[in-house]
Amino acid sequence: LPAQVAFTPYAPEPGSTCRLREYYDQTAQMCCSKCSPGQHAKVFCTKTSDTVCDSCEDSTYTQLWNWVPECLSCGSRCSSDQVETQACTREQNRICTCRPGWYCALSKQEGCRLCAPLRKCRPGFGVARPGTETSDVVCKPCAPGTFSNTTSSTDICRPHQICNVVAIPGNASMDAVCTSTSPTRSMAPGAVHLPQPVSTRSQHTQPTPEPSTAPSTSFLLPMGPSPPAEGSTGD
C-alpha cells in the first residue's frame, strides 16, 4: 500500500524534517507551507490551518521561500554615482552598483552602499594595479626607462622611445625626444610632429613589469654635438 501523503499542516515523524517548501513552526509544532518569493505570511499556521500567504506591497520584496510576517523594504534609490543594475520588484531588492570611473568603497549584502572615484595616477606615476568594482587603482612611480605624462586612472608607465641620438632625454613624466637622423617623414594630419624614432612602440595595455626591462635613455646620449644627418632639416 503506498504511503499516505500528508497535507500541511501535519506533525512530522520524530527525528524527521519537513519537506521541501515547508517549515517546522515552533508554536504550532507542525510542518507548514512556506510562502513563495514575492509573498509573505499573512496568517501563521496552527495545528488545524495552514499558512495564509499574501503578496508583498509596493517597494517591498521577498526573494526566498519564507514565512516572514512582513516583506522586506527595498533599498533606497541609487545615488548619482551609482547605476541601478536591478530594479526593486516583489521578488528582488534594488541593486545599485558604481558607475564607470568609480569603485565600491563600502559594499552591502548585494550591490554597493558607498562608491568612491578611482584614484588617478599623476605624471611620473602609472597604474600598477587597475581598479576593480571593489578596489581602488594602485599607482607606482615609473621605473627608469619608462614614463607616464598623463593624470589617469588607466594609463600605465610606457617605455621611452629608443633613439639613435637623443635630443632630450626622457624622465618619469616625459618621453625621450630623438634627434632626427633621416628626412622627416610625412605624418597623418593632427599627429604630433616629433623627430622619427628608430623603433616605434606599440601602445601597451598591461603594466610594465617591475623592475622595468626597458632600456634607459641615459645611455643613448651622444658624446658631443653631432652634425645633422644628411638631407635633414634642423627643427
Partner: nanobody, 123 residues
Framework: EVQLVESGGGLVQPGGSLRLSCAAS????????VAWFRQAPGKEREEVSC????????NYADSVKGRFTISRDNSKNTLYLQMNSLRAEDTAVYYC????????????????WGQGTLVTVSS
C-alpha cells in the same frame, strides 16, 4: 533552497575546545537567521545558539552562556560555533538550521537541517 553541512565535531576532554562549522550551499547564508541545535541521546533537540539574519543579535541557551560563541562569515557562506570549557553534558549531535529573514532569536521555525556532527566530551 539552502543546504547545510556541519563539521568539526569529535572527541574532546572536559575543559577542552572545539569549533563547529556549518557550510551552506544553494543560497546565501546572509539571507537567513541561523541557529545551532543539539540533541543528546534520549533527549529533545534544543536550541543552543542563534544569530539573526542581519547579524545584529545573538542568543544563547543558559547552559552555554559565556562558554559558546556563535559567528558567521558571509564571504565563506559559513556559520561557526566556538565551544570552550566543554563539559560532559555538552555531549550531543550538533545541527545547524535556518530561518529565512529571521529577525529574532530563538527562531520561530526551522527550514533546512544539516546531517549533524557528533561532539563527545569525555576523559
Amino acid at each position: 533552497e539552502v543546504q547545510l553541512v556541519e563539521s568539526g565535531g569529535g572527541l574532546v576532554q572536559p575543559g577542552g575546545s572545539l569549533r563547529l562549522s556549518c557550510a551552506a550551499s544553494g543560497s546565501r547564508l546572509d539571507y537567513y537567521a541561523v541557529a545551532w541545535f543539539r540533541q543528546a541521546p534520549g533527549k529533545e533537540r534544543e536550541e543552543v545558539s542563534c544569530i539573526t539574519y542581519s547579524g545584529g543579535s545573538t542568543n544563547y541557551a543558559d547552559s552555554v552562556k559565556g562558554r559558546f560563541t556563535i559567528s558567521r562569515d558571509n564571504s565563506k557562506n559559513t556559520l561557526y560555533l566556538q565551544m570552550n570549557s566543554l563539559r560532559a553534558e555538552d555531549t550531543a549531535v550538533y545541527y545547524c538550521t535556518t530561518e529565512p529573514y529571521g529577525s529574532s532569536c530563538p527562531l520561530s521555525g526551522y527550514d533546512t537541517w544539516g546531517q549533524g556532527t557528533l561532539v563527545t566530551v569525555s576523559s
